[in-house]
Interface confidence: low
C-alpha cells in the first residue's frame, strides 16, 4: 500500500499488516489520514507564545508576533532595555518591560539623565552673591562684607576689636562705625582730643587730661580758667 | 506653570464603569510616564497604574488588574484612567501623578461606589 | 506591591527634631536610590519634600533632610513648627511600579 506514497512528504508509511492499508506517521505539525492536513497550533488551546505574544499559524508550524520588550521564537526572553546603557551621568537603568527608566543622580533630569539642573535657577544667593552652578551643587561667590553658603551672614567686622580707648563698635553691612567714649575721636577713637586747644586758661598754663583739661595759674590770678 | 487636572469623578454603583481624565500643561507630556494615585477616605496613598511615555508599557497595581485601563493621549496632553467592575472598595480621590525628580500632583477627583 | 512600613504616628513640640522611618525590601528602598518623601494636608494633594533619598526641591526648608541605610529611609524634620503637623508618606520604586508607605502623622504639641 505504500508503493503509491499515499502519504504527505516527510512522513513515514507503514503498511497494516491486518487490512494491508497505508498507516501514515505524520511529523509535528501535520494530521489526517494522509498527513495532509497543517495543525493550528495557535487553536489548540494554550497560547504557545509567551508574554501575551500573538500567535501566527503556518505551514507545519507556527510564529510568535512578540509585544515590545520580548523576543525568542516563543517570545519567552524579556529583552534588556538597559543592555544599551542608555542612562547617562552615572544614573542607575530600571529594565522595565519594554522600555527602560533611569533613576538620575542629583543633580540631573531628563528621560536619559542628561540634562545638568541649574541649581542656580531659584536664585539661592542672597545679598546681591553670584550664583556658580555646578554638578549637583552651586557655589555663591559672596560680596565683601558677607559670608556663608548662601551669603546669608553678615561679617562681623566688630569681631577684630577696631575700636579703642573703650570706644563702642558698631556693625554694618560692609563697615563699622566707633562710638568713642568722651574725650577720644578718630575712626577708631585712637586720637585723644586735646582739650587745651584753643587755650583755655587765660592767665595760666593748660595741662591736658582725658576729656578735661587743669589751669595752672599764674601768681595772682584763679578759677578754673584763671579768668 | 506645570500643572495637572483631573475630571470625570463622580457616584457609581457598583459594577458600573467611569472614565477618569487628566490634562496636562506647562511641560513636555510625552517625555514623562504618568501615574495614577489613590487615596481611600482616612487612609494611605496606594499606587493604581503608570503608563510609559509613548504609552507603549502599562502597570497595574494587583487591585485594579483586569479592570482598569491606563491610555494617554499625548496630542492632546491628556492621561485617562478607564475603569470598569467598580466596587465598593474602589471609593477614593484619584490623584493624576507626574512622579519623578520634579514631582507633579493633581489636586484629585472623588469617586465614589455606592448603591 | 506591599505597602513599605512607617510608624502610624509621631510627635514633638515645637523646635524640637523627630524622625520618621520607613522601612522596606532589598526589592524596593534597598535596591535603588529612588525615595521620596511626601508631605499632606487635610484635604490637600501631597507635596513632594525630599527626592533621591535626601534632596530637597527648590522651596522646601533645609529644616527637612532624608537619609537611607540598608532597608530603612527616614525623614527628619529639625526645628519643628506648627505648620509641620501632617501625613507624611514615604515611597519608593520597585521593578515595575511605585510603591508607598502606609503614612505617619505628625502631631506638634502645645
Known amino acids: 500500500a505504500c508503493i503509491s506514497n499515499p502519504c504527505n512528504e516527510g512522513s513515514n508509511c507503514d503498511t497494516n499488516p491486518v487490512n494491508g492499508k497505508a498507516i501514515c506517521t505524520c511529523p509535528s505539525g501535520y494530521t489526517g489520514p494522509a498527513c495532509s492536513q497543517d495543525v493550528d497550533e495557535c487553536a489548540l488551546g494554550a497560547n504557545p507564545c509567551e508574554h501575551a505574544g500573538k500567535c501566527l499559524n503556518t505551514l507545519g508550524s507556527f510564529e510568535c508576533q512578540c509585544l515590545q520588550g520580548y523576543t525568542g521564537p516563543r517570545c519567552e526572553i524579556d529583552v534588556n532595555e538597559c543592555i544599551s546603557n542608555p542612562c547617562q551621568n552615572d544614573a542607575t537603568c530600571l529594565d522595565q518591560i519594554g522600555e527602560f527608566q533611569c533613576i538620575c543622580m542629583p543633580g540631573y533630569e531628563g528621560v536619559y539623565c542628561e540634562i545638568n539642573t541649574d541649581e542656580c535657577a531659584s536664585s539661592p544667593c542672597l545679598h546681591n552673591g553670584h550664583c556658580m552652578d555646578k554638578i549637583n551643587e552651586f557655589q555663591c561667590q559672596c560680596p565683601k562684607g558677607f559670608n556663608g553658603h548662601l551669603c546669608q551672614y553678615d561679617v562681623d567686622e566688630c569681631a577684630s576689636t577696631p575700636c579703642k580707648n573703650g570706644a563702642k563698635c558698631l556693625d554694618g553691612p560692609n563697615t563699622y562705625t566707633c562710638v568713642c567714649t568722651e574725650g577720644y575721636t578718630g575712626t577708631h577713637c585712637e586720637v585723644d582730643i586735646d582739650e587745651c586747644d584753643p587755650d583755655p586758661c587765660h592767665y595760666g598754663s593748660c595741662k591736658d587730661g582725658v576729656a578735661t583739661f587743669t589751669c595752672l595759674c599764674q601768681p595772682g590770678y584763679t578759677g578754673h580758667h584763671c579768668e | 506653570e506645570v500643572q495637572l487636572l483631573e475630571s470625570g469623578g463622580g457616584l457609581v454603583q457598583p459594577g458600573g464603569s467611569l472614565r477618569l481624565s487628566c490634562a496636562a500643561s506647562?511641560?513636555?507630556?510625552?517625555?514623562?510616564?504618568m501615574s495614577w494615585v489613590r487615596q481611600a477616605p482616612g487612609k494611605g496613598l496606594e499606587w493604581v497604574s503608570s503608563?510609559?511615555?509613548?504609552?507603549?508599557?502599562?502597570y497595574y497595581a494587583d487591585s485594579v488588574k483586569g479592570r482598569f485601563t491606563i491610555s494617554r493621549d499625548n496630542s492632546k496632553n491628556t492621561l485617562y484612567l478607564q475603569m470598569n467592575s467598580l466596587r465598593a472598595e474602589d471609593t477614593a480621590v484619584y490623584y493624576c501623578?507626574?512622579?519623578?525628580?520634579?514631582?507633579?500632583w493633581g489636586q484629585g477627583t472623588l469617586v465614589t461606589v455606592s448603591s | 506591591q506591599s505597602a513599605l512600613t512607617q510608624p502610624a504616628s509621631v510627635s514633638g513640640s515645637p523646635g524640637q527634631s523627630i524622625t520618621i522611618s520607613c522601612t522596606g525590601t532589598?526589592?524596593?528602598?534597598?535596591?535603588?536610590?529612588?525615595v521620596s518623601w511626601y508631605q499632606q494636608h487635610p484635604g490637600k494633594a501631597p507635596k513632594l519634600m525630599i527626592y533621591?533619598?535626601?534632596n530637597r526641591p527648590s522651596g522646601v526648608s533645609n529644616r527637612f533632610s532624608g537619609s537611607k541605610s540598608g532597608n530603612t529611609a527616614s525623614l527628619t524634620i529639625s526645628g519643628l513648627q506648627a505648620e509641620d503637623e501632617a501625613d507624611y508618606y514615604c515611597?519608593?520604586?520597585?521593578?515595575?511600579?511605585?510603591?508607598f508607605g502606609g503614612g505617619t502623622k505628625l502631631t506638634v504639641l502645645g
Open positions: 501623578a507626574r512622579i519623578s525628580q520634579q514631582a507633579v
Open positions: 506647562g511641560f513636555t507630556f510625552s517625555n514623562y510616564g
Open positions: 503608563i510609559s511615555g509613548y504609552g507603549s508599557n502599562t
Open positions: 532589598s526589592s524596593d528602598i534597598g535596591g535603588y536610590q529612588y
Open positions: 533621591y533619598v535626601s
Open positions: 515611597q519608593s520604586a520597585d521593578s515595575s511600579s511605585w510603591v
